[in-house]
């Protein structure tokens, strides 16, 4: 068997750190056997079998010019193996952040805090933090650790499914390369990292006969659980074209009637979501949708709220995305919000 421990990484590659002494190991001989070393492609002897170093080659204060392939051979000239030297640095603690788009699952992403220049992998796990009685120092088996499954496509992300909203979790992301390992521990609670995805299917329609009104409607983000125990609240912003400032309202439900639109001007509308008990933070804004108030006169009869109307003069402008999926059933808290007519 080879006297060389196989570091994690491609076979035949050995590793060292710039500026440090590096030992290369001849893989095809018995430990301690004297060997000769050559640089591949250069015939001059680097280190002879009389060096007293056995099967190892010592490079003092390695630098980038030492990177490359080396040949070792036995006393009688047989090939002992070829070794490629790659220089780099041990891992540093990775930068880790976690986020949740709903209250049942969360994901963590990471990136190296320093580039090691070496093949690198990440080990990801988590455990649930529990406060045990003073008499018990044991960790409850139900607390983990468990693996945090990584994205199969190699993205630097892992996902914890079925998390408990009220629990605290400790995330462990360990950066591993052939020169070592370094761990970052991050304590997270779903409440603090919850940030819903933006609402979907935003539509902006004119209200026939009301030249200062626009009706906006949207749906819950698809990532929010279909039968939620936790509701979302919303924040809506709108502004006329070429107007720099947004007006903000907090609708009570999944739609809002804007009553102070500027007649004749297209308006941009966007909407954001947040847990209704203010856990976490507001979502990013949805893509803007545009609509222009109706230019027609007030009809004699105001149709029932929510019916589609034939426009007397101008078609209502609707945002460009395809029609949204059917929205969730309205939540008990969702009320119509209208101005007085």
């Amino acid at each position: 068997s080879s006297p060389c421990p196989q570091a994690w990484g491609p076979p035949g590659v050995q590793y060292g750190q710039p500026g440090r002494s590096v030992k290369l190991c001849c893989p095809g001989v018995t430990a301690g056997d004297p060997v000769s070393w050559f640089r591949d492609g250069e015939p001059k002897l680097l280190q002879g079998p009389d060096s007293g170093l056995g099967h190892e080659l010592v490079l003092a204060q390695a630098d980038s010019t030492d990177e490359g392939t080396y040949i070792c051979q036995t006393l009688d000239g047989a090939l002992g193996g070829t070794v490629t030297l790659q220089l780099g640095y041990p891992p540093a603690r990775p930068v880790v952040s976690c986020q949740a788009a709903d209250y049942e699952n969360f994901s963590c992403t990471w990136s190296p805090s320093q580039i090691s220049g070496l093949p690198t992998r990440y080990l990801t796990s988590y455990r649930k933090k529990t406060v045990l009685g003073a008499d018990s120092q044991r960790r409850s088996p139900s607390t983990g650790p468990w693996p945090c499954p990584q994205d199969p496509l190699g993205a630097a992300r892992c996902v914890v499914h079925g998390a408990e909203f009220w629990s605290q979790y400790r995330i462990n992301v360990t950066e591993v390369n052939p020169l070592g390992a370094s761990t970052r521990l991050l304590d997270v609670s779903l409440q603090s990292i919850l940030r819903p995805d933006p609402p979907q299917g935003l539509r902006v329609e004119s209200v026939p006969g009301y030249p200062r009104r626009l009706r906006a409607s949207w749906t819950y983000p698809a990532s929010w659980p279909c039968q939620p125990h936790f509701l979302l609240k919303f924040r809506l912003q709108y502004r006329p074209a070429q107007h720099p400032a947004w007006s903000t309202v907090e609708p009570a439900g999944l739609e809002e009637v804007i009553t102070d639109a500027v007649a004749g001007l297209p308006h941009a509308v966007r909407v954001s979501a947040r847990d209704f008990l203010d856990a976490g933070t507001w979502s990013t804004w949805s893509p803007e949708a545009w609509g222009t108030p109706s230019t027609g006169t007030i009809p004699k009869e105001i149709p029932a709220w929510g019916q589609l109307h034939t426009q007397p003069e101008v078609e209502p402008q609707v945002d460009s995305p395809a029609p949204p999926r059917p929205s969730l059933q309205p939540h008990p808290r969702l009320l119509d919000h209208r101005d007085s007519v």
Epitope: S36, F38, E42, P43, G77
Partner: antibody, heavy 117, light 107 residues
Amino acid sequence: QVQLVQSGAEVKKPGASVKVSCKASGYTFTNYWMHWLRQRPGQGLEWIGNIGPSDSKTHYNQKFKDRATLTVDKSTSTAYMELSSLRSEDTAVYYCARGDYVLFTYWGQGTLVTVSS
Amino acid sequence: DIVLTQSPATLSLSPGERATLSCRASQSISNNLHWYQQKPGQAPRLLIKYASQSISGIPARFSGSGSGTDFTLTISSLEPEDFAVYYCQQSYSWPLTFGQGTKLEIK
């Protein structure tokens, strides 16, 4: 014991090619480099090139780079040296030699190649 | 290419005498120099490697020394079978090259 047995003498016309073989026995063929050298009549030794034991990687003397081709057949433990575009000054005894990366430890008996019109 | 110059071209000595053969390199080659012996009609035989390292099976009367550009092969007491042509070879850089040879003949 280590043996390198080369193919027999060849007579070639200028411009032709010659392929000399070297059959190895008595050792693990893929553990050692094989070198090719030549010695012109009454002259010294010239190194043509070598071929790696496991990966067939070659190093050539630039003097022969465009005309010499070194190959091996691992299944028969045989090394080959082909020299093309022969001229009269290529008349020489051609040797294969088992060695390490840069030394020549065991030699074949030599193959006389005569280039004559 | 590194040029190796051997001297003398011919050395005439008697059995029992000490022979000193010289090889000079056109540039410093550290200790990457080797010595071979060739008898008429035979292939060369490796005698000394890396300037001074002995080879298994080679009589102890053969020794080598030198470093950098100047190297010496010494045969401490000549035996009749030692009369042959001796070549030095460098392995400091490609191509591997040989000296032109020193012929050791019986006086």
